[in-house]
């Protein structure tokens, strides 16, 4: 087909220590020679679809997918990944080819998949398909650790069935709440699989290998804590092991602990007890409830009782498949230039999610915090007051979730102007979107008060840059205004900004900023 553009698809691998990567996602520095990905026309597909050779990437590697388009005129484009659209800014190289880039920083499982690039040129529309996968994903795995009781010993073994074999460590903490964060001095780490000291406040086991780090907390009910207003909830998938620890401290040994499931005592062999005297001669007892492989009928209220403490319960829910529950409706926010603001997503999920925040094709680390009501929250505050589209993406073994946010920054318009032989155009990105006026400056109107209404064409939001709308106004040149100074003004509720343009014969156009 004569009309089809000449397309070249390339892969650029960035060295990991390349400080240039990510500084500008539109124009990444080339670290190594680009690898040609072919981009052949896909036969028997509806529409024009080019398919690049499959791309295999190491975990944590940084790459750029790049398309070079040899087609006349302007092009516009859109990237789509996992049903999320990411806007793209084409630019032109020295050979006047359109260049479209997608930077993927520190490749993770989340970023693997099909990247679709839709390009619209003056002549035709076409689609380019990239398939990106992680090298060795079939060989490498990292599974969440789980617990087993050590045969004939009061100890727990931590197991993570991962490849390559992970380093397993216990993370122990004996204080409450915030002071049990990983970096805290109250936290003790033991790089071993077996743990005998099971009386601590907070016990976690973590496994790490090349793919990262996964942790599992030993679910605990502490009868010395005031009963919560919301029952703690524990989710497990069918076949996973259940471990709940009940802990109580009393002035002497004259108390016992019991576990019940829905008011029935747990069967012999599904619990074991340990006790010790603490330094101040009080007695600590712990009672473990465990099921080596849970079934649906293990769902219910597990209650730990003591004759000397208020009883407490946890709701254990056994599910067939993991889930992520959250509202996925997109949210728009409008803030002032110096207003403190964070995006936040509240969700309930099992197993624990991996997540990222993305803005303008850059991914940012995602932190999660557990709330008392069984929900978790992830916040993103590092937007640096840049308007646009922000994406929260979360996934676990069984589910995926994406939520879009738009951030608008209230500010006075700033005007940029450009002119050609036949027209003058002004652009502004102020918010709320500005309205436009054009004025003619002449002997009769030295203050440029004579309004121009003929030949003006306003376009609201004609190009969307990462979700940031830009407004433009174009004045078609007529004999009546040739050779005159004209002034375009953009105004919104926060103020007005103007630019003065001399409409002379073709050539360089002087612009005068006038605020």
């Amino acid at each position: 087909n004569q009309d089809l553009p000449v397309i070249k698809c390339v892969l650029i691998n960035h060295k990991n220590n390349d400080s240039s990567v990510g500084k500008s996602s539109s124009y990444p520095m080339v670290s190594e020679s680009p690898e040609d990905l072919g981009c052949a026309l896909r036969p028997q597909s509806s529409g024009t679809v080019y398919e690049a050779a499959a791309v295999e990437v190491d975990v944590s590697a940084s790459i750029t997918l790049q398309v070079l388009v040899d087609a006349p005129g302007n092009i516009s484009c859109l990237w789509v990944f996992k049903h999320s659209s990411l806007n793209c800014q084409p630019h032109f190289d020295l050979q006047n080819r359109g260049v479209v880039s997608m930077v993927i920083l520190k490749m993770t499982e989340t970023q693997a998949g099909e990247y679709l690039l839709f390009i619209q040129s003056e002549a035709t529309n076409y689609t380019i398909l990239f398939t990106v996968s992680i090298r060795n994903t079939l060989l490498y795995t990292l599974r969440r650790p789980y617990f087993r009781k050590m045969e004939n010993q009061d100890a727990l073994v931590c197991i993570s069935e991962s490849v390559p074999e992970p380093i397993v460590e216990w993370v122990l903490c004996d204080s409450q709440g915030e002071s049990c964060k990983e970096e805290s001095p109250a936290v003790v780490k033991k790089e071993e699989k077996v743990l005998h000291e099971l009386f601590g406040t907070d016990i976690r086991c973590c496994a790490r290998n090349e793919l990262g780090r996964e942790c599992t907390r030993l679910f605990t009910i502490d009868l010395n804590q005031t009963p919560q207003t919301t029952l703690p909830q524990l989710f497990l998938k069918v076949g996973e092991p259940l471990w709940i620890r009940c802990k109580a401290v009393h002035v002497n040994h004259g108390f016992g602990l019991t576990w019940e499931l829905e008011n029935k005592a747990l069967e012999e062999g599904n619990y074991f007890e340990m006790s010790t005297y603490s330094t101040n001669r009080t007695m600590i007892r712990i009672l473990f409830a465990f099921v080596s492989s849970v079934a649906r009928n293990d769902t219910g209220y597990y209650t730990c009782s003591s004759s000397k403490h208020p009883s407490q319960s946890a709701l254990v829910t056994i599910v067939e498949k993991g889930f992520i529950n959250a509202t996925n409706s997109s949210e728009d926010y409008e803030i002032d230039q110096y207003e403190e603001f964070c995006f936040s997503v509240r969700f309930k999920a099992y197993p624990q999610i991996r997540c990222t925040w993305t803005f303008s094709r850059k991914s940012f680390p995602c932190e999660q915090k557990g709330l008392d009501n069984g929900y978790s929250i992830s916040k993103f505050c590092n937007h640096k007051h840049q308007p646009g589209e922000y994406i929260f993406h979360a996934e676990n073994d069984d589910a995926q979730f994406t939520k879009m946010f738009t951030l608008n920054i209230r500010r006075k318009p700033q005007v940029l102007a450009e002119a050609s032989a036949s027209q003058a155009s002004c652009f502004s990105d102020g918010y709320p979107l500005p309205s436009w006026t054009w004025k003619k400056c002449s002997d009769k109107s030295p203050n440029c008060t004579e309004e121009i209404t003929e030949g003006v064409w306003n376009r609201k939001a004609n190009r969307k840059v990462f979700g940031q709308w830009v407004s433009s106004s174009t004045l078609n040149m007529s004999e009546a205004i040739k050779g005159f100074l004209v002034k375009c003004c953009a105004y919104n509720s926060l103020g007005t900004s103007c630019e003065t343009i001399l409409l002379n014969s073709p050539g360089p156009f002087p612009f005068i900023q006038d605020n």
Epitope: T230, L231, N263, Y301, T303, S305, S307, S311, S313
Partner: nanobody, 111 residues
Framework: QVQLQESGGGLVQAGGSLRLSCAAS????????IDWYRQAPGKQREWVAQ???????HYEPSLKGRFTISRDNAKNTAYLQMNSLKPEDTAVYYC?????WGQGTQVTVSS
Amino acid sequence: QVQLQESGGGLVQAGGSLRLSCAASGSTFSKNYIDWYRQAPGKQREWVAQITSGGNTHYEPSLKGRFTISRDNAKNTAYLQMNSLKPEDTAVYYCRILDYWGQGTQVTVSS
């Protein structure tokens, strides 16, 4: 499904007494423990007392001696007897079984 309904709240002078009731529907009443909580205006909900299925009682330490929790399994009802009431006892009082809650009953203690 358990349904709970509190009653017995009202306006009382400081130093006076009130007896709150928590009536439950559902066959598991006798097998479950019952907690009373309260929530004063603008404050977090706080635990008050508990009675276990075996009749053992536990209290928020600052309330022990003034408040008494009891239950009548035949009537599927739990009670909270409150004596020597103080203005700071003004709150909505709720009973709870597992994660089922009642609607609450208002207790107002005037000075």
